[in-house]
Every structure is written in structure tokens, then in C-alpha cells.
Amino acid sequence: MMTGTIETTGNISAEKGGSIILQCHLSSTTAQVTQVNWEQQDQLLAICNADLGWHISPSFKDRVAPGPGLGLTLQSLTVNDTGEYFCIYHTYPDGTYTGRIFLEVLESSVAEHGARFQIP
């Protein structure tokens, strides 16, 4: 019985060349979070492990920074960074919770942040 929910930053947009923070928050469960994975489509961006700390995938280490918290900061954004991002919470004893964020990188200097929403 998985009772938790993941709240994310939802659909967000940012300027090309800028940076953005991807954030997820797991609530409504007392489960122990053992690890959080950040993925873009099928690519692993980073892992934050409760014991071992952060690991950034080598191919992203120049543009991805850990934090704040269990979030992830994407830097030097390009239009190719547009797409879906997933935070995957590995927990005991519940198992895995996944949150989704859609990022749109705009050429324009007018980039507005979307509203927060919840994914059960």
C-alpha cells in the first residue's frame, strides 16, 4: 500500500543559456527514502544516495549541479534540453515513487514558471 505523493515544480520554462532548478518532494508517507534518481527520458542525470551522497553522470557533470536539497540544477540550458525530466524516489518499504517535470527552453527572454502540481 503506497500512500505517498510526489509534488513537483510541474511544467516550467526557462531561457536558453540560463539555469533552472528541478524540484520534487515526497509527502504523505513515513517511508525511508534511500535514493533519488534524476532522469531525462531514458538518460540518468544524477543520483543522490542517502549514504553515499551525490553522483553526477559524467556526460552531464559540466552542466548539472546537485541541489538544492534533493533537487537538481541545470545550467547553460539549450533548446535540446526541452523535454521530460523524472525524479525517482527509491523508498523502503513502499518501493518507487516517480514525479514528472516538463521543461521548455525558450529562445525568448520571456520565460515564465508554471504552477506546482501533484502526481500521486
Partner: antibody
């Protein structure tokens, strides 16, 4: 073998304060959730407070009867957890146990307890 | 708050007999979050069973646990003298974590 040793208990008047300490040895303290559980004389067990890991931003939770009066904290560099108890009431009289928990390792160790007596 | 009610409050049995201790929750508890502890006089509680049915390290296999939802049971197939103690069920499924009031298993 992991050992937990509580200290700081004693006799205090209603409205007074005490600070309980729990020192851990024999393990990587920072990897464990820490809890305080109390047991009034001749009564059952009551969970009091929990503090999680740096990984969880040191999230804390309390039983309703102590919210606003008790504060749990930890110092991973000293392998210690604390319970600051203010505005003590006679019903806070109990043996206070420190517990060290790692759910996914099925690890659950208790100290021997320290007696807090609130009486005029 | 999830209230755990244990029954009976006291169970008087003789060594060699079978003991059945019950724990009833006021609302559903996931079986992974239901633990049992044993406590002897003057000592701290000790984890006895975790996740409803798994014996903690060093616990003899005459002990077993079962249950789901709101009803859980600790069973001792054949009582040994060292089994006489107080047993508490415990849930960490939701805050505040709670314990049952305990079942005292005493020698008849």
C-alpha cells in the same frame, strides 16, 4: 556492537527544563534515524520524537502532546542526539529511551533509558 | 492517530503451551510498517518481529507473526520460560507513531 547511552535525566519542577543527550558508538551514526520513546512508571511505550538524516534535511516529527515544548536535534560530528524539554509537566515523568533505526537494514537499537521526574 | 489495541491485557499460560497475542488497529496499517517488541522488567524494549512476520536477529523460530489491514497476531508455538515478558505492537505507517498498550505474558 552499537551502543546508545542516554544522560541528562533527573528531578525537575513543573514548568522547568531539561536537555537529554544520547551518545552512540560502534556505527556510522549519520546513517540512522534517531527517535525518543518514553515510558511512564508502570505504563506502556509512547513515541515522542524523530529526527531523520541530513539527506532528509534533518526532518523532525513529534507526538502532539509535546509540540512546542520539546525539540529534537542531532550532531552527527558528535554521534549524538538531543531532546530539549521545556515547560515540563508532571505527565512528562517517564523513562526516556533513545532509539537508533535503519528500516531497510532491519536495524533497531535502544539505549537503557534515563529517568525524568517532574514533581514539585 | 492510529490507535493499537492489544488483547488480552494479561495472558496466563504454562511453559509448553501455545500463546496467541492480538493487535487491532483503528485504521489500516500496511503490513510492512507493523512491528512487535518484547520488554522484560527493568530493561529496554527489544525489536522482536518486523514487517508483521519477519523475526529480528536472534529470535527463535517458535515465534511467528501474521496479519494484515487492521488485525495482527504474534504467536508462540511452545512457550519457554524466557518468553514470559510484555509484548508491544507498534506502527510507523503514519505520524504519530504509536504502540499498543502491551500484553503481559505471565506464568500460570
Amino acid at each position: 556492537e552499537v551502543q546508545l547511552v542516554e544522560s541528562g535525566g533527573g528531578l525537575v519542577q513543573p514548568g522547568g527544563s531539561l536537555r537529554l543527550s544520547c551518545a552512540a558508538s560502534g556505527s556510522t551514526f549519520s546513517n540512522y534515524w534517531m527517535n525518543w520513546v518514553r515510558q511512564a512508571p508502570g505504563k506502556g511505550l509512547e513515541w515522542v520524537a524523530e529526527i531523520r538524516l541530513k539527506f532528509n534535511n534533518y526532518a523532525t516529527h513529534y507526538v502532539e502532546s509535546v509540540i512546542g515544548r520539546f525539540t529534537i536535534s542531532r550532531d552527527d560530528s558528535k554521534n549524538s542526539v538531543y531532546l530539549q524539554m521545556n515547560s515540563l509537566k508532571t505527565e512528562d515523568t517517564a523513562v526516556y529511551y533513545c532509539t537508533m533505526v535503519r528500516r531497510n537494514w532491519y536495524f533497531d537499537v535502544w539505549g537503557r533509558g534515563t529517568l525524568v521526574t517532574v514533581s514539585s | 492517530e492510529i490507535v493499537l489495541t492489544q488483547s488480552p491485557a494479561t495472558l496466563s499460560l504454562s511453559p509448553g503451551e501455545r500463546a496467541t497475542l492480538s493487535c487491532s488497529a483503528s485504521s489500516s496499517v500496511s503490513s510492512s510498517y507493523l512491528y512487535w517488541y518484547q520488554q522484560k522488567p527493568g530493561l529496554a524494549p527489544r525489536l522482536w518481529i518486523y514487517s508483521t512476520s519477519n523475526l529480528a536477529s536472534g529470535i527463535p523460530d517458535r515465534f511467528s507473526g501474521s496479519g494484515s489491514g487492521t488485525d495482527y497476531t504474534l504467536t508462540i508455538s511452545r512457550l519457554e520460560p524466557e518468553d514470559f515478558a510484555v509484548y508491544y505492537c507498534h506502527q510507523w505507517s503514519s505520524y504519530p507513531y504509536t504502540f499498543g498498550q502491551g500484553t503481559k505474558l505471565e506464568i500460570k
